[in-house]
Interface confidence: medium
C-alpha cells in the first residue's frame, strides 16, 4: 500500500493543501485513496511511513511575523484531529519572495478509515511547480 | 533492495551530483547499482522510496538571484528524463556563505533499468563533509 | 520493527537530544527500544531507514558564527561512534529568533545492539512543541 500525490493550486481559503493524482503520481491500490483532493485515507490498520514536502515562497515584510508552518495531521474515525508532525521556517528577506522547502516524515500507526492531510499557515505562498510540493505514504 | 551513497566532490561542469560507495554506504545487492558515479539504476520493476539530502553553502551577493534548487530526476529506458521532486532554498546573507540543507523523498514506480539522479543549480556550493550530502532508495 | 519518538526538553548540558514515548509515538515491539531517553537500540541486524526531524529557533547575533547542525550518529557494540547524516542551517536574522526545520533520513545497516542518536550544536535552541522534533526508524 503506497501513495504519492501532487500539489494542486486551489482558490479555497482553507489552510488544508489540495492534492491530485496527476503527473508522476502513485496510488498502489484501492486500500489507499485520495479523498476530496485533500486527504489520504487508508482502509487497513497498520504502521505507515507518512511524508510531505512543501515548497513555499514568502517575504518577511509581506508576511505575518509568525513563521510559515506545515503540519501533517491525522483524523481517525470518531476521534479529534491531531498533529503528527510540524515544521517551521522563518520568512525570507529576499524580494519579491524567497523560496524554502520543508520536508516532514515519520512512522505512525493508522486505524482503518484514518485520514492524513497537510495544513499550512498560508496556502497562497505554496509553490506548485513540478516536484516542489508532494504528499505520500507507504505501509510497512 | 536498498542503496545509500555518499557525495563526491567533482569539478565536472555538469549539474548532476556525483556519488561514491564510500564511508558508511549501503548497496544491498546487484539489483541496484551506482552507474558512472551519478545514478542509481534498478533492475526490478516496483515501488521505491527514493530520497536525497543536499547541504550547500551559498551567499546571496555571490550567487545568481535564482534560488539553489535540488532536483530528483528519473530516466526510464526509452523515455525522456523527468523531474520527480524538487526543493528550493533562497541563498543566505551570511558571509562568506551560509549553509542550508535540503531533503527530498517520495514513493515512485520504477521500471527495470530505470535510473534516478540528483541535479543541482550550482554543484560548487555543495558541502561534502561527512554525512552532509547523500542519496538513496529502498524497494517497498 | 519500527519506532517514532518525541522530543523531550532536557536540562542536561549534553548535545545529545532527549526523547520520550509520549504523544503519538510508535514502538512496534521489544526488538527496538529507547534507552536512557537518548538512543534507539535495535536487537536485530539488518537494513533500517532511520530519520530525524529537528526544529530550532536561533538568531545570528545571539548564536556562535557556526551554523546549527543536527547529526544522526551510530554507536555499534565495540566500535567508535560515527556520523551517519548531518544537516546544517545558518542562523536566522529574525528577532528574537527565527524558526527552521531540518530533516535527516537514510538507509543504513545496523548490527545487533547498535544504537542511533541525534546530536545538535545547541540543544537549548530546539523546539519541543507538538510535532516539531522527532526521531525514528523502520526495518526494511
Amino acid at each position: 500500500i503506497a501513495a504519492h500525490v501532487i500539489s494542486e493550486a486551489s482558490s479555497k481559503t482553507t489552510s488544508v493543501l489540495q492534492w491530485a493524482e496527476k503527473g508522476y503520481y502513485t496510488m498502489s491500490n484501492n486500500l489507499v485513496t485520495l479523498e476530496n483532493g485533500k486527504q489520504l485515507t487508508v482502509k487497513r490498520q497498520g504502521l505507515y511511513y507518512i511524508y510531505a514536502q512543501v515548497t513555499f515562497c514568502s517575504n518577511r515584510e509581506a508576511s505575518s511575523q509568525a513563521p510559515f508552518i506545515a503540519s501533517l495531521c491525522l483524523k481517525s474515525p470518531g476521534r479529534f484531529e491531531r498533529i503528527l508532525l510540524r515544521a517551521a521556517n522563518t520568512h525570507s528577506s529576499a524580494k519579491p519572495c524567497g523560496q524554502q522547502s520543508i520536508h516532514l516524515g515519520g512512522v505512525f500507526e493508522l486505524q482503518p478509515g484514518a485520514s492524513v492531510f497537510v495544513n499550512v499557515t498560508d496556502p497562497s505562498q505554496v509553490s506548485h511547480g513540478t516536484g516542489f510540493t508532494s504528499f505520500g505514504l507507504l505501509k510497512l | 533492495i536498498a542503496a545509500h551513497v555518499i557525495s563526491e566532490a567533482s569539478s565536472k561542469t555538469t549539474s548532476v551530483l556525483q556519488w561514491a560507495e564510500k564511508g558508511y554506504y549501503t548497496m544491498s545487492n546487484n539489483l541496484v547499482t551506482l552507474e558512472n558515479g551519478k545514478q542509481l539504476t534498478v533492475k526490478r520493476q516496483g515501488l521505491y522510496y527514493i530520497y536525497a539530502q543536499v547541504t550547500f553553502c551559498s551567499n546571496r551577493e555571490a550567487s545568481s538571484q535564482a534560488p539553489f534548487i535540488a532536483s530528483l530526476c528519473l530516466k526510464s529506458p526509452g523515455r525522456f528524463e523527468r523531474i520527480l521532486l524538487r526543493a528550493a532554498n533562497t541563498h543566505s546573507s551570511a558571509k562568506p556563505c551560509g549553509q542550508q540543507s535540503i531533503h527530498l523523498g517520495g514513493v515512485f514506480e520504477l521500471q527495470p533499468g530505470a535510473s534516478v539522479f540528483v541535479n543541482v543549480t550550482d554543484p560548487s556550493q555543495v558541502s561534502h563533509g561527512t554525512g552532509f550530502t547523500s542519496f538513496g532508495l529502498l524497494k517497498l | 520493527i519500527a519506532a517514532h519518538v518525541i522530543s523531550e526538553a532536557s536540562s542536561k548540558t549534553t548535545s545529545v537530544l532527549q526523547w520520550a514515548e509520549k504523544g503519538y509515538y510508535t514502538m512496534s515491539n521489544n526488538l527496538v527500544t529507547l534507552e536512557n531517553g537518548k538512543q534507539l537500540t535495535v536487537k536485530r541486524q539488518g537494513l533500517y531507514y532511520i530519520y530525524a526531524q529537528v526544529t530550532f529557533c536561533s538568531n545570528r547575533e545571539a548564536s556562535s558564527q557556526a551554523p546549527f547542525i543536527a547529526s544522526l550518529c551510530l554507536k555499534s557494540p565495540g566500535r567508535f561512534e560515527r556520523i551517519l547524516l548531518r544537516a546544517a542551517n545558518t542562523h536566522s536574522s529574525a528577532k528574537p529568533c527565527g524558526q527552521q526545520s531540518i530533516h535527516l533520513g537514510g538507509v543504513f545497516e545496523l548490527q545487533p545492539g547498535a544504537s542511533v542518536f541525534v546530536n545538535v550544536t545547541d540543544p537549548s535552541q530546539v523546539s519541543h512543541g507538538t510535532g516539531f522534533t522527532s526521531f525514528g526508524l523502520l526495518k526494511l
Partner: antibody, heavy 125, light 103 residues
Framework: AVTLDESGGGLHTPGGALSLVCKAS????????MQWVRQAPGKGLEFVAA????????NYGAAVKGRATISRDNGQSTVRLQLNNLRAEDTGTYYC??????????????????WGHGTEVIVSS | LTQPSSVSANPGETVKITCSGG???YGWYQQKSPGSAPVTLI????ERPSDIPSRFSGSKSGSTATLTITGVQAEDEAVYFC???????????FGAGTTLTVL
Amino acid sequence: AVTLDESGGGLHTPGGALSLVCKASGFTFSSYGMQWVRQAPGKGLEFVAAIDDDGSSTNYGAAVKGRATISRDNGQSTVRLQLNNLRAEDTGTYYCAKDGIIYYWNADAGYIDAWGHGTEVIVSS
Amino acid sequence: LTQPSSVSANPGETVKITCSGGSGSYGWYQQKSPGSAPVTLIYWDDERPSDIPSRFSGSKSGSTATLTITGVQAEDEAVYFCGGYDDSSYAGIFGAGTTLTVL
C-alpha cells in the same frame, strides 16, 4: 587569534618515516577542515593532504598518495601527517593550514585562511 | 594552475594577477621570502581575512580568478601563489607563483 604550530621536522633517512603534528588554537578546531602543504627548496607550494572536520574524509596529493596518512584528534586540537617510504624529494618546509569555510570540505586549496609557520624536513642519507 | 611568472608596478599603481585552470574556489597567498609562512590574502574566491588590508581584493569570472592590488606599496613585493582545486585528482593544487616587483 588563530595559531597553528607544526612539529616533527628534522633530518630523516630515505626509506624511513616521519610524523608531523600540528597543534591548533584560537578557533573551534572540530568545525574546520585542515590541510598540509609543502614547499621544496626554491620551489612553489604543493598540496599534500586534507582532512574534513570530523576526520572521516581525506584526500592526498599525487606525489604522496599511498605513502601518506592524515588524521586528526579533535579532543586535542591536533592534526597529524604520517609519511612513509621517504624520498629525497620529500625534503622541504611543511605547513599546516586551516580551511576558512566552516563544516565545508572539498580538499580545495582555495579555502585556506590561515597557515602555520612551517617545519623543515630534510630527507638525506 | 596557470599564473604569470612575474609582474612589476610602480608604487600607487593597480596590479592584477590572474590564475586559471582550477574548478573550485580560488585562494591567493603571499610569501615574502622562501621558507617563510604564506599569508592568506583571499580565500573562497573573494573573501578577505579581517587582518588583510582592503587594497587586496579577489574576483572570479568563469574559471579564471584575479587578485587585484589597488595602490601597490613597496611592502607588497613578494611571491603570490594561487590555490584551487584539481578536477582530475579531487585534490588541492597551486600555481607556480607570481613574483611582484615594486619599481
